[in-house]
């Protein structure tokens, strides 16, 4: 997960945009990535970075938990 996020974040050269990406990686079981992104007011660049990293992180976590379930069988 960390490697993939670092790969994505590396393309954001504006520090705030990069940090928006990292914010998206934080675990939040109560809201979707879209719901969380809707509260961002600093600009579309932040929304885009947050959403991309949030979605990728969610997918990777889902894949990992799916693998864990398979291993547990």
């Amino acid at each position: 997960l960390q490697e993939k996020i670092e790969e994505i974040a590396a393309k954001y050269k504006h520090l705030v945009v990069k940090k928006c990406c990292y914010d998206g990686v934080r675990i939040n079981h109560d809201e979707t990535c879209e719901q969380r992104a809707a509260r961002i007011s600093v600009g579309p660049r932040c929304v885009k970075a947050f959403t991309e990293c949030c979605v990728v992180a969610s997918q990777l976590r889902a894949n990992n938990s799916h693998k864990d379930l398979q291993l547990g069988r």
Partner: antibody
Framework: QVQLVQSGAEVKKPGSSVKVSCKAS????????IHWMRQAPGQGLEWMGY????????NYNENFKGRVTITADKSTSTAYMELSSLRSEDTAVYYC???????????WGQGTTVTVSS | DIVLTQSPASLAVSPGQRATITCKAS??????????MNWYQQKPGQPPKLLIY???NLDSGVPARFSGSGSGTDFTLTINPVEAEDTANYYC?????????FGGGTKVEIK
């Protein structure tokens, strides 16, 4: 209407520090990044750094080698720029500006003249 | 860091003529089709004022005689026709990455 109002002119001795304030009004302070630039007499604009008040995130121009510190007080909607170890070359007009959409500076403070002289 | 080179350093133009200022970036300021290049006007004793953002978008209240063009590394600010009140310094600025950088400026004088 959006306004950035800066503190008044300062005269400082070499080796001392200066702290310039930038009070924002007319918009939600935490929604936008505040940048600081300076302009030496007859020279161009030099970017110093910024703060995102909502999160406290900062970034600085490495040319200032740790001499600059930017802070923000959300309760008063005020950003501050402190420059230490002042030298004569730091004599300049210092500006704060709001960055809109992480793209461009749409509002600027009126500027604060800092003179460093022994 | 992205270095922005403006040319010419100064120019004198007659009223009604065209003034053209160029800004060359040391690397592309385009990100996913969006050019993070802006232009500002600064008159003596005043802070800079936004003219053009995203290479070609005129800020509100800016006269239509100002226009911006370009992409990637090469950008142009055009004033056509020039008026007496356009005497000022003009700066390009990139915001695609930190540190934000400015061009060295172009002084426009009216003949």
């Amino acid at each position: 209407q959006v306004q950035l109002v800066q503190s008044g002119a300062e005269v400082k001795k070499p080796g001392s520090s200066v702290k310039v304030s930038c009070k924002a009004s007319g918009y939600t302070f935490t929604d936008h990044i505040i940048h600081w630039m300076r302009q030496a007499p007859g020279q161009g604009l030099e970017w110093m750094g910024y703060i995102y008040p909502r999160e406290g995130w900062t970034n600085y121009n490495e040319n200032f080698k740790g001499r600059v510190t930017i802070t923000a007080d959300k309760s008063t909607s005020t950003a501050y720029m402190e420059l230490s170890s002042l030298r004569s070359e730091d004599t300049a007009v210092y500006y704060c500006a709001r960055e809109r959409n992480l793209e461009y500076f749409d509002y600027w403070g009126q500027g604060t003249t800092v003179t460093v002289s022994s | 860091d992205i270095v922005l080179t403006q040319s010419p350093a100064s120019l004198a133009v007659s009223p009604g003529q065209r003034a053209t200022i160029t800004c060359k970036a040391s690397q592309s300021v385009d990100y996913e089709g969006f050019n993070y290049m802006n232009w500002y006007q600064q008159k003596p004793g005043q802070p800079p004022k936004l003219l053009i953002y995203a290479a070609s978008n005129l800020d509100s209240g800016v006269p239509a005689r100002f226009s911006g063009s370009g992409s990637g590394t090469d950008f142009t600010l055009t004033i056509n026709p020039v008026e007496a009140e356009d005497t000022a310094n003009y700066y390009c600025q990139q915001s695609v990455e930190d540190p934000h950088t400015f061009g060295g400026g172009t002084k426009v004088e009216i003949k």
